[in-house]
Interface confidence: medium
């Protein structure tokens, strides 16, 4: 069996890995919505009870003319309506929520479950970054423009672990490292010096960098090579 | 007449007051239950290994796993036997790769490596089965009829599969479905 090149890393399986759990957006918002509804109901409830007590104190045991009594009945009627609305809200909302959750789950499944996190559809996520894994070959400059048009940047490699991961995914691709000539240092897209070894650097015609099976190599900027784009989350 | 009117209004007031009180107690009970329900049963609880991203339409994966189309994949670079691979995936609350279709690992299609997947032959069912017990679709690997049933299956993300001794060591891919 043919083996792909160097990949120096693998899963470290601790006995009890600690993991965070977060709620998905839809449900989190739904829960918040419910809490808001409840808070709203509580406020009305407090207001209603205050009104009720207040009126009770003011008008208790007095032989009143009909107008104030009408007022009391009106206030009590409004309070009843508010309370009924609150009761209906609390009874109906959770079942609606469950229904909405079930529907959204169903919809997500039927939509081929394509979209993940903050990344565009068909991109992959890894370690807080989104990656577009291209299949088209472009020159280095064309690749740079293609990634810009996708609101991202030509693949940058921030650390050794990322390089190892990318080497598993794709044997070779352009990276955002270049030099003006063989007399100039290798720099990243933000103009910082790139300190790591780039193979074949002594060849004056090879001034753009490629990730090739866990190695960084220099290549002719005009060569057509697969490109990948990256966007940090 | 004024006395009758006053009595009538008092009667209505009393009735409404009782209704208000009963509604208030109902509301109190409902509020208590709702809060209890919210704290005990969130609308959706992710599995222990899955870290769901806030503000995410779908999902994010554990560190060092790849998220793609709402699945998480761990792509190993260590070679293991098929059984070892299966246990390693299980220990991460995932399973050896079960393919829905041959473009599932589209993002790895230029890889030349073969990986163990969760397919093995069941003597009992006389069929190639995925780890969850479902049968292999005959359209997935046209060559599956030539597979040696004593062997396990290694898969290359460009769509090829081959059978190898389960004791051979290969890299492997674990998969977690997030929905």
């Amino acid at each position: 069996m043919d083996n792909q090149g160097v990949i120096y890393s693998d899963l470290n399986l601790p006995p009890n890995p600690k993991r965070q759990q977060r709620k998905p957006k839809g449900n989190k918002n739904s829960i918040l919505a419910t809490e808001q509804e409840i808070t709203y109901a509580e406020l009305n409830l407090q207001k209603a009870s205050q009104d009720f007590q207040g009126n009770d104190k003011t008008y208790h045991c007095k032989d009143l003319p009909s107008a104030p009594e009408k007022l009391i009945v009106g206030i009590l009627g409004i309070i009843c309506l508010i309370l009924m609305a609150s009761v209906v809200t609390i009874v109906v909302i959770p079942s609606t929520l469950i229904q909405r959750h079930n529907n959204s789950s169903l919809n997500t499944r039927t939509q081929k479950a394509r979209h993940c996190g903050h990344c565009p559809e068909e991109w992959i996520t890894y370690s807080n970054s989104c990656y577009y894994i291209g299949k088209e070959r472009r020159t280095w400059e064309e690749s740079l423009l293609a990634c810009t048009s996708k609101n991202s940047s030509l693949l940058s490699i921030d650390n050794e672990e990322e390089m190892k991961f990318l080497s598993i995914i794709s044997p070779s691709s352009w990276i955002g490292v270049f030099r003006n000539s063989s007399h100039h240092p290798w720099v990243t897209m933000n103009g910082l010096a790139f300190k790591h070894e780039i193979k074949d650097s002594d060849n004056a015609e090879l001034n753009c960098a490629v990730l090739q099976v866990n190695r960084l190599k220099s290549a002719q900027c005009g060569s057509s090579i697969i490109y990948h784009c990256k966007h940090k989350l | 007449m004024a006395v009758f009117k006053t009595t009538l209004w008092r009667l209505i007031s009393g009735t409404l007051g009782i209704i208000c009180l009963s509604l208030m107690s109902t509301l109190g009970i409902l509020l208590k239950n709702s809060f209890t329900k919210l704290s005990i049963e969130p609308a959706f609880t992710p599995g222990p290994n899955i870290e769901l991203q806030k503000d995410s339409d779908c999902c994010s994966c554990q560190e060092k796993w790849v998220g793609y189309r709402c699945n998480c994949y761990f792509i190993s670079s260590e070679q293991k036997t098929w059984n070892e691979s299966r246990h390693l995936c299980a220990s991460q609350k995932s399973s050896l790769l079960q393919l829905q279709n041959t473009d599932e690992l589209d993002f790895m299609s230029s890889s030349q490596q073969f990986y163990w997947i969760g397919l093995s032959y069941s003597e009992e069912h006389t069929a190639w089965l995925w780890e969850n017990g479902s049968a292999l679709s005959q359209y997935l690997f046209p060559s599956f009829e030539t597979f040696n049933t004593k062997n396990c299956i290694a898969y290359n993300p460009n769509g090829n599969a081959l059978d190898e001794s389960c004791e051979d060591k290969n890299r492997y891919i674990c998969k977690q479905q997030l929905i």
């Epitope: 083996n3 120096y8 050794e160 672990e161 390089m163 190892k164 866990n214 | -």
Partner: antibody, heavy 118, light 107 residues
Framework: EVQLVESGGGLVKPGGSLRLSCAAS????????MNWVRQAPGKGLEWVSA????????YYADSVKGRFTISRDNAKNSLYLQMNSLRAEDTAVYYC???????????WGQGTLVTVSS | AIQLTQSPSSLSASVGDRVTITCRAS??????LAWYQQKPGKAPKLLIY???SLKSGVPSRFSGSGSGTDFTLTISSLQPEDFATYYC?????????FGQGTRLEIK
Amino acid sequence: EVQLVESGGGLVKPGGSLRLSCAASGFTFSSHSMNWVRQAPGKGLEWVSAISSSSSYIYYADSVKGRFTISRDNAKNSLYLQMNSLRAEDTAVYYCAREEWGLPFDYWGQGTLVTVSS
Amino acid sequence: AIQLTQSPSSLSASVGDRVTITCRASQGINSALAWYQQKPGKAPKLLIYDASSLKSGVPSRFSGSGSGTDFTLTISSLQPEDFATYYCQQFNSYPLTFGQGTRLEIK
């Protein structure tokens, strides 16, 4: 200048424990995977364990799995190998070696001798 | 694990000779192979990586070739300081493995 200096070797009884250290200098330690390699007297090289730059990925040779633990402290520029349940066959010179972004071991320490004997 | 078999286990040669050492992998490792030189009482020293890439600072008389399962290290013209033990190592996948070594002695 890149320097790796191992320490912590010595004589230990079978079943005993030992902790090796490797002090790194002259490079950005936190950017590199590090490895332990050993060499029994008069024998060849045997890779023992590897740890990636931020400790996310850890590997062991089958012969030491479950007994040895590799770790690192990037703040102290140090690599460690905790060796438990030592056996006579663990007697060797232990080297720490650096990787350059996936290149093989481009720098090695001078080694520290571990002798397991009763 | 991937086994690496070096041949010969030892060889005698003279200064100025051209020497070839081979390393065979039990399965394909593409070009993920390195060669090291070790002198008695010293740590190994990297000579060649990626099967054929010469590490900077290593004399050009050392060269490597091969891909897949068969690899060779060639010393075009032996110098006195080249008498040592040479090891091949695969870094295609874990566990990493070394060949058993080839001892190069003065004839």
